[in-house]
């Protein structure tokens, strides 16, 4: 014969378990249905009746499938430095993650953050060598030779400096190179500034003294957009 | 006329070292940058390391750094490119080239080449 | 790979227009810098073709142009020749690195 489909509640086999979704209970001594998630139990079972489930109130949840007497308080409302990433529903709690420019430095569980700090920034002269996340700081290194930051940013690294045709200004840890030059490097590099004399800007590699140019120069070109490489550095 | 004409390529066995040379005329060698390009055997064009006009700073491509030096010599209007611990794949040809006016991030004249090759 | 894409291979026949593409990122044309094409024939050393995204050097023709929008740079050449196949190489500087950067480079075959 056919083994037939056991309904809730029921006695179990000895030594058999409750399929998914059932438990053992205890006082009735019978496996009974569990209720779904965003739901809980009003009612435990009997030796003659099943559980009875009812939904959860507002501001409370079941995020499995469950058999107990009250839902889960979701969590207090996202703090000021955080922004909700999951909503509080019958079926999940709130989850409030750390804004943009701050990471998680105490974290709950279920993926919320307890605790967001503000990310560092790196200063002139240095960059960043290891990206902040949403668990970790960021990590600062000074500007090796060769390369240059000079803004205060929690994302910019050290960038080399420009090359020149000839070094005006050499460039150092928190400045690019300047560099003597009769047109911009740049097409139309954003704020540039053009000085009466010869210069240019962005970094460069080696020590400090300007080179001796034999040739013409005619304009300064101050940078204040992006910047690029260089290595060994002094001024031409 | 301007005209670059590279030197001082040839085979040598990994480790070792090799010195590149190349003599420019035709424009006023201390007014610009110059440069090294090599071109693994065919493959695409890699920018090795340049020095401004006054030999005061000096670059390099990561690949080479700590191995390769640029120099020059603005009264014998020479480059040259000092090559130790060479790697197999440090094989290419190897372009000096002249940085443009103005603005020196482009070659507005190259050698003819010169072909290294590392090998054992 | 290269830190600018170029399309491996571009074809046409004589007489046809034919356009290379040059593709960058922020912190290369995308950031302002120009963009400059260097022309390879067969067995010879590069020879500039295009400087800052549109120039052309003296004793280059008119059949060759440049353009450049956004992120990225475009390699134009008219009327096409026998005599223009070759390798062609975009580069432009790279706020990330110390010198400029090259495209893998477009191997240019003129067909018929």
């Known amino acids: 014969l056919p083994a037939q489909v056991a309904f809730t509640p029921y006695a179990p086999e000895p030594g058999s378990t409750c399929r998914l979704r059932e438990y053992y209970d205890q006082t009735a001594q019978m496996c009974c249905s569990k209720c779904s998630p965003g739901q809980h139990a009003k009612v435990f079972c009997t030796k003659t009746s099943d559980t009875v489930c009812d939904s959860c109130e507002d501001s409370t949840y079941t995020q499995l499938w469950n058999w107990v007497p009250e839902c889960l308080s979701c969590g207090s409302r996202c703090s000021s430095d955080q922004v909700e990433t999951q909503a509080c529903t019958r079926e999940q709690n709130r989850i409030c993650t750390c804004r943009p420019g701050w990471y998680c430095a105490l974290s709950k569980q279920e993926g919320s953050c307890r605790q967001c700090m503000r990310l560092s920034k790196c200063g002139p002269g240095f960059g960043v060598a290891r990206p902040g996340t949403e668990t970790s700081d960021v990590v600062c290194k000074p500007c090796a030779p060769g390369t240059f930051s000079n803004t205060t940013s929690s994302t910019d690294i050290c960038r080399p400096h420009q090359i020149c045709n000839v070094v005006a200004i050499p460039g150092n840890a928190s400045m690019d190179a300047v560099c003597t030059s009769t047109s911009p490097t740049r097409s139309m590099a954003p704020g540039a500034v053009h000085l009466p004399q010869p210069v240019s800007t962005r970094s460069q590699h080696t020590q400090p003294t300007p080179e001796p140019s034999t040739a013409p120069s005619t304009s300064f070109l101050l940078p204040m957009g992006p910047s690029p490489p260089a290595e060994g550095s002094t001024g031409d | 006329e301007v005209q670059l004409l590279e030197s001082g390529g040839g085979l040598v066995q990994p480790g070792g070292s090799l010195r590149l040379s190349c003599a420019a005329s035709g424009f006023t060698f201390s007014s610009y940058a110059m440069h090294w390009v090599r071109q693994a055997p065919g493959k695409g064009l890699e920018w090795v390391s340049a020095i401004s006009g006054g030999a005061t700073t000096t670059y390099y491509a990561d690949s080479v750094k700590g191995r390769f030096t640029i120099s020059r010599d603005n009264s014998k209007n020479t480059l040259y490119l000092q090559m130790n611990s060479l790697r197999a794949e440090d094989t290419a040809v190897y372009y000096c080239a002249k940085g443009g006016t103005g603005d020196p991030y482009y070659f507005d004249y190259w050698g003819q080449g010169t072909l290294v090759t590392v090998s054992s | 790979q290269s830190v600018l894409t170029q399309p491996p291979s571009a074809s046409g026949t004589p007489g046809q227009r034919v356009t290379i593409s040059c593709t960058g990122s922020?912190?290369?044309?995308?950031?302002?810098?120009?963009v400059h094409w260097y022309q390879q024939l067969p067995g010879t050393a590069p020879k500039l073709l295009i400087y800052r995204n549109n120039q052309r050097p003296s004793g280059v023709p008119d059949r060759f142009s440049g353009s450049k929008s956004g992120t990225s740079a475009s390699l134009a050449i008219s009327g096409l020749r026998s005599e223009d196949e070759a390798d062609y190489y975009c580069?432009?500087?790279?706020?990330?690195?110390?010198?400029?950067?090259f495209g893998g480079g477009t191997k240019l075959t003129v067909l018929g």
């Open positions: 580069a432009a500087r790279d706020d990330g690195l110390s010198g400029p950067v």
């Open positions: 922020s912190s290369n044309i995308g950031a302002g810098y120009d």
